[in-house]
């Protein structure tokens, strides 16, 4: 805090608020009899600059010239020191340094909508840090002026409030800032215009969509925007894109027929408008209008894939799988799918509508020639069937594809690669590449994949639906004509060694040897693909190593004989399972000891 | 924003004296400079005197010597006593404050109060 001054004055040339890089002369004098004891000699006139002694002086004054002052207030304080006592305050002064306006820059004007009134902006340039008073002055025909001030630190906008009129479009109007603070002053350049160059139309509001027919391919958008407006600007795209269409339209009147819509599609349509073809500036978007466009009937045809199963020797079973169309092709939302079962020779068919699934089983005769046709529908109508004679896929053994792998391609890949068939490979029409988790049981209700791949490719990467640490049985067929030829292989596209072995639930003595029965690991637990059980037994209470029997995998399997256990000694057995990465833990031990004679 | 009300002025002969007050009120905490300045017709305003909260003091040449500005903190009141009057000291005599804003001045002004020095 700076005290009043009592015992003499400070006073500051040219003044207390100054411009940055310029002088301040300091003086500070002592009021009569205000020295020490009398002895003017003796008074010590110390000036600070907060505090930091700057300078000083024996006397009754001292004039001190000043410097380098950054931006902002700086403190000075005078003091008197005399002989034996402390330093005694005298007067103080702050010194406030700014900077005079620079001239503004980038004045632009506008009037929103033909209602609107001027603003104009402006770019202050560098802070002041002064109040800084912005006069705005327009200039038009007939000798008009209109004047605006702003009186803040930060101004940059004035609004003149007066509304510009199309009376004469092309009649010229200047507008000028000057910026004026205690430093200084600075005037932009003008900017001349015309009412055509600064109305910015209000955005086109009241947007609609009519489909004449409920057909997208008679579309019409219709707005409404103000009187004048020449020109407009539409732009659209469905509402899960990122890149919008643009279509310009001139003399437009409100209305605009789009003809490249997508069916079954929501889109987002926005309008801007302008009044003249190079003149003045667009308007903001209108707000979004959002429409779904209506359907029409399915394009393409459906992926359709099957599978038989031997029932007995009369009845087989058919399943039918097929792959949603894309939204593309489906143009709609699919109802339900049509399925038409006939036997070619006798002419009977059958027709079934699905609704909410992708497959359909059913039992059908061994005997006779069979076809499937599948079709997808929605409100508008049906896509063209698929149509399928349903033969052994495997029938064919020179058509079987030959050297069959799998092997894992990353993070829930499979790369399966084949060689063409024996037979003449140019027979080939096409490949289909099958594959399904593996579950002991052979369960149908496994949800099956696959994909279909050109007669010249021997590799396929498969990748929907698969898990890691799960094996999958792998079909590879090669169709041609009303024939087909298959190859299949386990595989996986991680693995890991089992979590657990197989669990030993029967030992059983047959003729001199034993029989172990087990079952299978759970899948959860077989972490990919089981390529080996091993069988491990030694004599009870015996540290001697263990012998093995190591057997291939099979999915069927869950039995073994073993013959090389002597009689009435008592055996522990146990198992493990192993995937290509290791083996299991074993399974649970079980004693034995065969009952038969010696050799 | 500081509201500033001048008073004070009038008509006066060659060689008399006037004091002119200015009173602050509203925000008035914190006023850093207190000054009078001064336009007469056809002129650009010109600063007469400037008293800051400390004490300190500013005078224009012309009229050092013969003027002298005091500030009362506590009321937020400056005077300008005026002596020797010249007829070159006519004008309209404006008050201004200049408040500490963050790191920058803000800046009020008073109405005016005409001063007229006859010879």
């Known amino acids: 805090k700076i005290d009043a001054c009592k015992r003499g004055d400070v006073t500051v040339k040219p003044s207390h608020v100054i411009l940055l890089g310029s002088t301040v002369n300091i003086t500070c004098s002592l009021k009569p009899r205000q020295g020490c004891f009398h002895y003017s000699r003796r008074n010590k006139l110390i000036l600070y600059k907060f505090d930091r002694r700057i300078n000083f002086h024996h006397g009754h004054s001292l004039n001190s010239q000043v410097t380098g002052l950054p931006l902002g207030t700086t403190l000075f304080v005078c003091k008197l020191a005399c002989i034996n006592s402390d330093e005694i305050q005298i007067c103080g002064a702050e010194i406030f340094v700014g900077v005079a306006p620079e001239q503004p820059q980038n004045l632009s004007c506008i009037q929103k909508g033909e209602q609107g009134t001027v603003a104009c902006t402006w770019e202050r340039g560098r802070d002041t840090h002064l109040y800084t008073e912005y006069t705005l002055q327009l200039s038009g025909p007939k000798n008009l002026t209109w004047q605006k001030q702003c009186k803040d630190i930060y101004c940059d906008y004035l609004d003149f409030g007066i509304n510009l009129t199309p009376e004469s479009p092309e009649s010229n109007f200047t507008a000028k800032v000057t910026a004026v603070n205690s430093l200084g002053s600075s005037s932009s350049l003008p900017s001349t215009f015309t009412f055509l160059d600064i109305v910015r139309p209000l955005p086109p509001w009241d947007i609609r969509i009519k489909f004449q027919k409920a057909s997208v391919s008679r579309c019409t958008l219709y707005w409404r925007d103000e009187g004048l407006v020449l020109l407009n600007r539409l732009r659209y795209r469905p509402s899960n894109s990122r890149l919008w269409n643009m279509v310009n339209v001139t003399k437009a009147k409100g209305r605009h027929d789009l003809l490249d819509l997508k069916p079954f599609t929501e889109y987002e349509f926005q309008i801007s408008s302008k009044l003249h073809l190079y003149k003045g500036s667009w308007s903001d978007w209108s707000e979004s209008l959002r429409a779904q466009t209506p359907e029409e009937e399915p394009t393409g045809m459906l992926d359709v894939w099957y599978m038989k199963r031997h029932i007995d020797y009369s009845r087989q079973q058919i399943s039918l799988f097929w792959k949603n169309l894309s939204v593309s092709e489906a143009r709609g939302k699919i109802l339900h799918y049509q399925v038409t079962l006939q036997e070619l020779t006798g002419g009977k068919a059958m027709t079934q509508n699905i609704t909410g699934h992708t497959s359909w089983t059913t039992v059908i005769p061994r005997t006779g020639n069979w076809a499937v046709a599948v079709s997808a529908a929605n409100s508008k109508g049906s896509s063209l069937p698929t149509r399928i004679n349903i033969m052994n896929l495997c029938e064919a053994g020179l058509l079987a594809p030959r050297q069959v792998s799998a092997n894992s391609e990353g993070m829930d890949n499979i790369l399966v690669t084949w060689q063409p068939p024996r037979k003449d490979p140019s027979a080939v029409q096409e490949y289909v590449v099958e594959w399904r988790e593996l579950h002991p049981g052979g369960d149908t209700q496994v949800p099956l994949n696959w994909l279909r791949s050109r007669p010249y490719n021997v590799s396929a990467l498969i990748s929907e639906n698969i898990k890691s640490y799960i094996c999958y049985e792998i079909r590879v067929y090669a169709l041609s004509g009303d024939q087909g030829g298959c190859s299949s292989i386990l595989g996986n596209s991680k693995h890991k060694a089992p979590l657990s072995g197989p669990h030993i639930n029967a030992i059983t003595e047959e003729k001199g040897s034993i029989l172990i029965s087990w079952n299978s690991i759970p899948v959860q637990e077989q972490m990919g693909c089981l390529l080996h059980y091993r069988i491990y037994w030694k004599e009870r209470d015996s540290n001697s190593q263990p012998q093995l029997c190591e057997i291939p995998y099979r999915v069927s399997q869950n039995s073994h004989p073993i013959n090389s256990l002597q009689p009435r000694v008592t055996y522990v057995l146990w198992m493990t399972a192993l995937t290509a990465a290791g083996e299991s833990s074993h399974g649970n031990e079980r004693e034995f000891c065969l009952q038969g004679k010696a050799n | 924003q500081v509201q500033l009300q001048e008073s004070g002025g009038g008509l006066v002969q060659a060689g008399g004296s006037l004091v002119l007050s200015c009173a602050a009120s509203?925000?008035?905490?914190?006023?850093?400079?207190m000054s009078w300045y001064r336009q007469a017709p056809g002129k650009q305003r010109e600063l007469v005197a400037e008293v800051s909260r400390g004490g300190s003091t500013t005078y224009a040449d012309s009229v050092e010597g013969r003027f002298h500005i005091s500030r009362d903190n506590a009321k937020n009141i400056v005077d300008l006593q005026m002596n020797s009057l010249k007829p070159e000291d006519t004008a309209v005599y404006y008050c201004?404050?200049?408040?500490?804003?963050?790191?920058?001045?803000?800046?009020?002004w008073g109405r005016g109060t005409q001063v007229t020095v006859s010879s």
């Open positions: 509203g925000s008035a905490a914190l006023i850093f400079l």
């Open positions: 201004k404050a200049d408040q500490n804003y963050g790191d920058s001045l803000r800046s009020s």
